[in-house]
């Protein structure tokens, strides 16, 4: 309805100024031009427009740039970034790290995690690098956002960022993400030795292959049961009882409390009961003695 009204004579603004705060909403709709707003974003931020008025301005900009805002405008957004949705941001093309850092500052403490993550993802998609400065600019946002990036975006995250990742950050990661992050972590921690290496890499072990876990079992790491439970089932079931015993060390006793839960249960199902009995923990669920295991998981040659 407001769209239908014409701009009253003499009300057409040639610049963004304080007079606009006294315009009725329908007048803003009828009179204000999106390209003028884009050119004078600094003034839009400076003048005390109401949220309602800024929403009208946003609607104007969205109509002017239906394919997403140009980078020249994104660089000038300032506080106006707070009115932009993650969906809007996904349409953008951002190549300047300074633009990203500036907007991350604006979003800090504003319950804008989704926008901040979308902005960084968009920057990575354009070939940008997520450096440690940027991770610091993301501030208190848990690094679980790494799991929101596409696998392609993850490739451009430098290995050094892995030093900042905590155990809870990867809880919602897909198996594919975990695999990629594990590779990055291996490269980040390659110069760390012994137990310190294990302490760093254990956060990422959900992405480790059976081969990696076998290698780890040779190093007396005494993995705790919480880390063991985070290992991917496909890797775990390939380990023998002896290898798991080496991997867990004295923590092997904790398998008993987890024997009816995945992934421990899945691993037990693939072990011979006689091997489990040798542990002396009373673990049940293994392959009964004298049974032959046939693997029907043979891939067909033609599909």
């Amino acid at each position: 309805d407001a769209e239908q009204k014409a701009c009253p004579p003499g009300k057409e603004p040639y610049k963004v100024d304080e007079d606009l705060i006294f315009y009725q909403n329908w007048e803003l709709e009828a009179c204000v031009d999106g390209t003028m707003l884009a050119r004078q974003m600094d003034l839009v931020n400076e003048i005390p427009f109401t949220y309602e008025q800024l929403s009208i301005f946003k609607h104007k900009l969205d109509k002017t740039y239906p394919q997403g805002y140009p980078e020249s405008l994104i660089q000038q957004l300032g506080h106006f970034f707070r009115y932009v949705s993650p969906e809007d941001i996904h349409q953008w093309n951002v190549t300047s790290p300074d633009t990203v850092k500036t907007l991350l500052k604006v979003s800090k403490g504003q319950k804008m995690n989704a926008q901040a993550i979308a902005l960084v993802a968009c920057y990575l998609r354009g070939g940008g690098q997520l450096d440690e400065d940027m991770v610091k600019a993301l501030g208190d946002i848990p690094l679980s956002y790494l799991c929101d990036f596409s696998p392609q975006d993850l490739h451009s995250v430098p290995s050094s960022v892995m030093w900042l990742v905590g155990p809870q950050d990867l809880d919602k990661c897909s198996q594919r993400h975990l695999g990629l992050l594990y590779q990055k972590a291996c490269s980040a921690f390659q110069n760390v030795s012994g137990l310190e290496y294990f302490e760093k890499i254990k956060t990422f072990l959900g992405g480790a292959s059976v081969k990696d876990l076998r290698a780890l079992s040779q190093h007396n790491v005494s993995m705790d049961i919480a880390t063991f439970k985070r290992l991917q089932v496909d890797s775990l079931v390939g380990l023998s009882v002896a290898e798991v015993q080496k991997l867990l060390g004295p923590n092997i006793v904790d398998l008993k409390t987890e024997e009816d839960k995945s992934p421990v249960r899945d691993w037990l199902f693939r072990q011979h009961q006689k091997d489990l009995d040798r542990l002396g923990l009373g673990l049940q669920g293994g392959i009964p003695n004298g049974y032959l295991v046939l693997d029907f998981n043979v891939r067909e040659a033609f599909s």
Epitope: P48, F49, T50, Y51, E52, Q110
Partner: nanobody, 115 residues
């Protein structure tokens, strides 16, 4: 969340004065600026005056020189001092706080100026 409660409205003669108060509570730190708006029956709400966090003030042409907006940070209150009132100043006056990501409004206080 920000809560706003207006007071000070009433019935006065043309030429007299009134002072409206707006008591602010809640997440005050999130407020960017505040304003007084008025609404006549059947009309769109219009801005009368605005004050920013640093104290810069803005006035609509129809109240310039007669109305003054001010704030008392210690009391978390914004005022609108209205002098030389005219019958056309009659309406419901609303206090508004702009924060991220919304505008918060009070319930309004009626001002009636009789000739």
């Amino acid at each position: 969340e920000v809560q706003l409660v207006e007071s000070g409205g009433g019935l006065v003669q043309a030429g007299e004065s009134l002072r409206l108060s707006c008591a602010v509570s809640g997440n005050i730190g999130s407020i960017r600026h505040m304003g007084w708006h008025r609404q006549d029956p059947g009309k769109e709400r219009e801005l009368v005056a605005t004050i920013t966090t640093v104290g810069t003030t803005y006035y609509a042409n129809f109240v310039k020189g007669r109305f003054t907006i001010s704030r008392d940070n210690a009391k978390n209150t914004v005022y609108l001092q209205m002098n030389s009132l005219k019958p056309e100043d009659t309406g419901v006056y609303y206090c508004r706080a702009t924060a991220h990501p919304t505008d918060y409004w009070g319930q309004g206080t009626q001002v009636t100026v009789s000739s």
